[in-house]
Structure formats: C-alpha cells, structure tokens
C-alpha cells in the first residue's frame, strides 16, 4: 500500500480528570474525501485499538457512542481527545490514518504520543 507522513506530539500529560488531547496531522499525498483515523495503544509490546472513526473531509469526526474518544477535524488535522484515563492507561498512543477514498489507498502511522496519566491524590478527610 502507499504511505504518507503522519505527525503527532511526542508527549502529552493527561489532566487530573483523566483527559488527554493531541493533534494528529497527515500530509495527504492525494485528494482524499473519506478518511479513517484509528488510535492504537502500545504497552509492553502489545498493541490494542483504542478507538476509530471514519469521516468525510469537511465533516465532523464521529466515534461510536460508547467510545472514550472524541475528535474534530480541520483540513488534514484531527484533534483527538481521550477521556476516562487512569494511571494504568499510561502508554504510547499511536495515530493511524487511512485515506479510504478515492483510490489510491494511503496509510500513515505516527511515531506515537506518550500519554502520562497520574491518578489524583484522594482528598484527605475533613471535618468541615
């Protein structure tokens, strides 16, 4: 298959509420109208799919209702947000972009964004 450049930040720190956002950019070698974006998590040499969405250029990105991901697209950039993260979810999150239509099919895979998640300290008991 044909390939393309995909870029994403090296490191992102999740918020105290377990939300991490990053931009996934791709250099489209052709005039794609249908794009599929997949977020993969790599930890301990195992790769699992976190979420995926297909969108038409110019339209919103739609993930499944029960997905932990949300996103918006703008040109050849996708702003991805992953929610509900906990310390155990720390890992390398890889953006995979596929130009589905029209042919030719292009596939690009980013180097990955290391997302660090720190569970918030529980609040100390209070008499107030």
């Amino acid at each position: 298959c044909k390939a393309m450049h995909v870029a994403q930040p090296a490191v992102v720190l999740a918020s105290s509420r377990g939300i991490a956002s990053f931009v996934c950019e791709y250099a489209s070698p052709g005039k794609a109208t249908e794009v599929r974006v997949t977020v993969l998590r790599q930890a301990d040499s195992q790769v699992t799919e976190v979420c995926a969405a297909t969108y038409m250029m110019g339209n919103e990105l739609t993930f499944l209702d029960d997905s932990i991901c949300t996103g918006t697209s703008s040109g050849n950039q996708v702003n991805l947000t992953i929610q509900g993260l906990r310390a155990m979810d720390t890992g390398l999150y890889i953006c995979k972009v596929e130009l589905m239509y029209p042919p030719p099919y292009y596939l690009g895979i980013g180097n990955g964004t290391q997302i660090y998640v720190i569970d918030p300290e529980p609040c100390p008991d209070s008499d107030f």
């Epitope: 870029a7 994403q8 950019e25």
Partner: antibody, heavy 116, light 108 residues
Amino acid sequence: EVQLVESGGGLVQPGGSLRLSCAASGFTFSDYWIHWVRQAPGKGLEWIGWISPSGGGTKYAQKFQGRVTISRDNSKNTLYLQLNSLRAEDTAVYYCARGAYEFDYWGQGTLVTVSS
Amino acid sequence: DIQLTQSPSSLSASVGDRVTITCRASQSVSSRFLAWYQQKPGKAPKLLIYDASNRATGIPSRFSGSGSGTDFTLTISSLQPEDFATYYCQQSYPTPLTFGQGTKVEIK
C-alpha cells in the same frame, strides 16, 4: 508572492550551537509542512528534518537525531533550526523549504561556517 | 534508507541537444514521491518535476520526467543556454528524505 528568508548564519566555534530562522510570507504558513535541507560547499543536498503544520510533530534524519531541534512559531510565520555540538562538517548553506513531499519553494539559504 | 544514484555524474552537451539523466533507487519508490530539481551556482534548488512526471508551475515543456519503481529519468528535449546547471532527484517517502548526488550539465 511566496517567500522564505533564512537568517542567523555566520561563523561558529566547534562545539558551539546555532539557531537559524526562516521567515515566511505570501502564504498561509500554518497550512504547510516545512523542511530544513543543507548543502556543504561543493557537495549535494542533505535533508535534516521536517516539522508538521501545527508544529506538533517533527522528524529528523538519523544522523541529526539528538543534536537538532526544528520548531516553529505560527503566530510569527517563522521556522527555527537549533543545531548543537557543531563540528567542521556542519559547515554548509542551510535552506528551509516548503512542502510535505516535493519542495515547491526554497529560501535563499544562509551560510554557516564552523571553524576556530 | 533509500539511496538514489544518478548517472551520469556530469555531462557535456550543446545547445539543442537532447539530454537524459537517470536516477536509480536502492529500493522501490512510489512515483508520487519522486521529484527533480535544478540548481544553479549560488542559488537555491528549483522544483522541476514532481510525482515523477508532472511539471511544476512555470517549467517549460522541454523538461519531462518518467519512470517507476527503481528507475526514473529526467529528459531535456532541447537544451537551452539557461539549462546548464546541476540536477538532483529526490525521494520523499519513507523518511529520511534522500537526494541523488547530482548531475552537472556543462557546456560542450
């Protein structure tokens, strides 16, 4: 008119650092992938690395990994190249160039001479 | 890394001659990612051909590109005085992006 103008070159001591700038005008800077390419005197072209439109992603040639940083400030339409631990072999003209794959516009280049 | 080897490294030709420069890749390159540049002394390179065969904006029709896989060619159908320069091929995927060593076209 599309323009890329490099600056910051000059004489640098071995072991020193340099920071080159590339000022862009005549196009929407934040829409484009930009690269740095260099050319040693009398030699061919050598790719250093690229930066994505938002600046969120960079990629470098293996030989520059850990010694080079490409960054950009889209609010200033400016690209930067930081190169550390300079040696004589880094003497070259440094160019910025626009485009993800083929480079349709290049700057005029800035000469960096590494010598004591 | 993909190595690009140009041949010849230099050539002498006359105005009006047909000139062919070859670029051979160490492994297959998609034609989408093969470009040719012209460089004159003291100047930045100038894009001539992209996607192996498409002329860049403002490039005269005497310049043409062809090829696929590992073998690509730049042809100048009728050499003009302003064409004496050094020509480079470039591949842009996968990284690292690489250039050929250049072909210098000189006046005979």
